[in-house]
């Protein structure tokens, strides 16, 4: 029969022959022959291969370097890489999470729209009319102005995006 030019899924072509790939978590030690199957060997500790493969070396698990603010979110296995995340108050600088930066704070006049996670930074939004923020914070949302009316008071000083309104007593009309 004609030697194959393409192989089935989970196979690879070598020496005009289709050989089985090694399963995830194992590396190749010997290609198959006409008389023998592919020989594989599990990856060692701190190594992995995450696909059906013909690799002769396993990949090293990612190291979550605490000096870069990283910690292990999910320990790697022989089939999966380690997943790193950042320490509390920090977030990854990229999708690969190779280093961390401090969460940004929202300045006065801005509130937190979305609190930062280990992989995303704080999202700030300007405080709309009727709301204010007078602090620099990575957690505080914009607060609504105080409602003077509900306290039977009147606005003595208008609020801004950075300050609350100032309420005062109503002027009594003398008879």
């Amino acid at each position: 029969p004609e030697p194959p030019t393409a192989c089935r899924e989970k196979q690879y072509l070598i020496n005009s022959q289709c050989c089985s790939l090694c399963q995830p978590g194992q590396k190749l030690v010997s290609d198959c022959t006409e008389f023998t199957e592919t020989e594989c060997l599990p990856c060692g500790e701190s190594e992995f291969l995450d696909t059906w493969n013909r690799e002769t070396h396993c990949h090293q698990h990612k190291y979550c370097d605490p000096n870069l603010g990283l910690r292990v979110q999910q320990k790697g296995t022989s089939e999966t890489d380690t997943i790193c995340t950042c320490e509390e108050g920090w977030h990854c600088t990229s999708e690969a999470c190779e280093s961390c930066v401090l969460h940004r704070s929202c300045s006065p006049g801005f509130g937190v729209k979305q609190i930062a996670t280990g992989v995303s930074d704080t999202i700030c939004e300007p405080c709309p009319v009727g709301f204010f923020s007078n602090v620099s914070s990575a957690f505080e949302k914009c607060h609504p102005w105080t409602s003077c009316e509900t306290k039977d008071l009147v606005v003595q000083q208008a609020g801004t995006n950075k300050t609350d309104v100032v309420c005062g007593p109503q002027d009594r009309l003398r008879a």
Epitope: Q23, Q26, S30, L41
Partner: antibody
Framework: QVQLQESGPGLVKPSETLSLTCTVS????????LHWIRQPPGKGLEWIGV???????DYNPSLKSRVTISKDTSKNQVSLKLSSVTAADTAVYYC???????????????WGQGTLVTVSS | DIVMTQSPDSLAVSLGERATINCKSS????????????LAWYQQKPGQPPKLLIY???TRESGVPDRFSGSGSGTDFTLTISSLQAEDVAVYYC?????????FGQGTKLEIK
Amino acid sequence: QVQLQESGPGLVKPSETLSLTCTVSGFSLTTYGLHWIRQPPGKGLEWIGVIWRGGNTDYNPSLKSRVTISKDTSKNQVSLKLSSVTAADTAVYYCAKNSYYGQGGHAMDYWGQGTLVTVSS
Amino acid sequence: DIVMTQSPDSLAVSLGERATINCKSSQSLLHSFNQKNYLAWYQQKPGQPPKLLIYFTSTRESGVPDRFSGSGSGTDFTLTISSLQAEDVAVYYCQQHYTTPFTFGQGTKLEIK
């Protein structure tokens, strides 16, 4: 039937190179890998390394800088070389056939009788 | 390297009685993708090379009597001889065949009481 026979000098001087040969019959070295294992007198087993049937090798990291395993398929022979030997390398040296059981499973299913190598001046 | 530790170091059992040898590995020998445990057992009689008894924790090599059985998973394994015979006197070694460097336990010497 499957047979393995280790051969080589029984006495090696310190700092010299230990050279052993494993001659096999009843199977082909292109079909099966071959391991070297040693056993100091009265002690346990230590894996030295393997030459897989495809010709690539894996060594014990504790010996890697000193060990070389190679094969001559046409002569059905595998050689072990261990350099810069000391008294701590005195042991019975075994060669053993690798058997592959699928799913990444390997074991040593046939062993030679072993040869005692003494390192002494 | 994976460290293999056997217990006890030596064992004396009466003929016809059950003998149990334990083996512990420093890391799991269970491959999560195929759920196989990569542990083998060898028997070495005085003046002889080791002989393969069991691989993949519990699969007996052909020709090995069924009184020999293996069990365990992860890091804890056991070799059991259900009814000890005189010819079973030997040193028994566990060995991880998970990954290189392949490593052996220190051995358990089995004698007749």
